[in-house]
Structure formats: C-alpha cells, structure tokens
Interface confidence: medium
C-alpha cells in the first residue's frame, strides 16, 4: 500500500532536526526504544510523541537552550518548532489518545531523534516497496 503522507512529513522533519545541533540536543530524554520488544508500532509512535512533548514543554523557554547569541536563539526556536510538528504528526500516525512512558533509560535528544529516523525510514522502505 501507499506510504502515508504523514510518514513522509515525519522523515522530512527528522532530517531537518538531525542536521543541526543546538545547545540542548545533548540533553537527555526517556529512551522508549531501549526495551520496546512487546510494544506495537502505534504505541511506539504515541510514546515517542509523548517524550517529545515532555521535552519541548520543559525546555521551550529554557535560557540555557536559547543561549546568548541571536543565532543560538533562532536555532533553538527552530528546534522547538520542528519538535512540535513532529509531535503533531506522530500523534496522527499513532491514533491513540495517550500512552504510558515509564522507562528509566535515558538517551540524548540527538540519539533519540536518530533512532526515530531509522525506524521511520524502515517503515517507509516497507510501505513504498
């Protein structure tokens, strides 16, 4: 079957997100991918969205992330804008209202996004073939 347009949008957003480091991409988030063997795809997307929402809700106005220079400020603003877009699209793909995120494992946001990108690309290659 055809790939969902949302999936393409997610990959595009993830490509943009992983291209550029900001002051806060090294901050840690809950690593939902560490033990996701018994998790459905929809649950994974839902939990990923939850993690991203927790991150940007907490760090959107974090002055450590906003930095001191105009460039740092705008890079962080762009990061948050992309994370919100990703969150919205993941919820759409998941089709679930809520999902628990209880893992103790942590990873950097940068690694989390790279892992998510790999998963999304794998999904895309399956649905486009």
């Amino acid at each position: 079957h055809k790939c969902d347009i949302t999936l393409q949008e997610i990959i595009k957003t993830l490509n943009s997100l992983t291209e550029q480091k900001t002051l806060c991409t090294e901050l840690t988030v809950t690593d939902i991918f560490a033990a996701s063997k018994n998790t459905t795809e929809k649950e994974t997307f839902c939990r990923a969205a939850t993690v991203l929402r927790q991150f940007y809700s907490h760090h959107e106005k974090d002055t450590r992330c906003l930095g001191a220079t105009a460039q740092q400020f705008h890079r962080h603003k762009q990061l948050i804008r992309f994370l919100k877009r990703l969150d919205r699209n993941l919820w759409g793909l998941a089709g679930l209202n809520s999902c628990p995120v209880k893992e103790a494992n942590q990873s950097t946001l940068e690694n989390f996004l790279e892992r998510l990108k790999t998963i999304m690309r794998e999904k895309y290659s399956k649905c486009s073939s």
Partner: nanobody, 116 residues
Amino acid sequence: EVQLLESGGGLVQPGGSLRLSCAASGFTFRNYGMAWVRQAPGKGLEWVSWIDASGTETYYADSVKGRFTISRDNSKNTLYLQMNSLRAEDTAVYYCAKSSGRFDYWGQGTLVTVSS
C-alpha cells in the same frame, strides 16, 4: 524598504529606568516577531528579549529577566523595551530587530549608558 528606528537611550544612574521605542516601517509589522538585541562595548551581540507577532509570547535572557519588559503596539507599528533596575553591565547599544527565522533587519541602535 524595511526601516527600524530606535529611540529612548541615554545616560542613567544605576537603579534607574529607561523606556526604549522602535518605530517600524516598510513591512507588515503585526506579522512578525520582534526582538531587542544589544552590544556592550568590546563584546558580541546578545539577544535581550523577543516578542511574537501578536504580543502574547515573550522571551527574556537570564541577565534581564524580572527587570526588562518587552511589549508592542501593532496599531502604531512600534516595539518597546521598559528597562528597570538598570545596572552598569546593561551599558550597550540596543538594537531592535525584525525576526523571521533569524534577525534579518536591524535598526541603527540607541546607546544606553548606566553610570553614576
């Protein structure tokens, strides 16, 4: 042509107040976020405060939080910065900047000197 004209700078004693204004023209002011950025003598540019297009969302650098207030009047195409409890380290040229993914247009700046 985009034009940003700052005013309101001057010499003030520590603990004093100033209100900076920035008159904007040449673009649809109400559609853009705006910022105040400063440059202290011999130092690089530092963003001070940012406000979204509607005036509802604001950001402040740690160094000015609780002392400075950014606001805007979209009917007058004007950006403001109310600066209270001024310190010597606030001495700088203050620029108003149009914000659209980066600070792409700047004014000429207004000098604020905090000294006793």
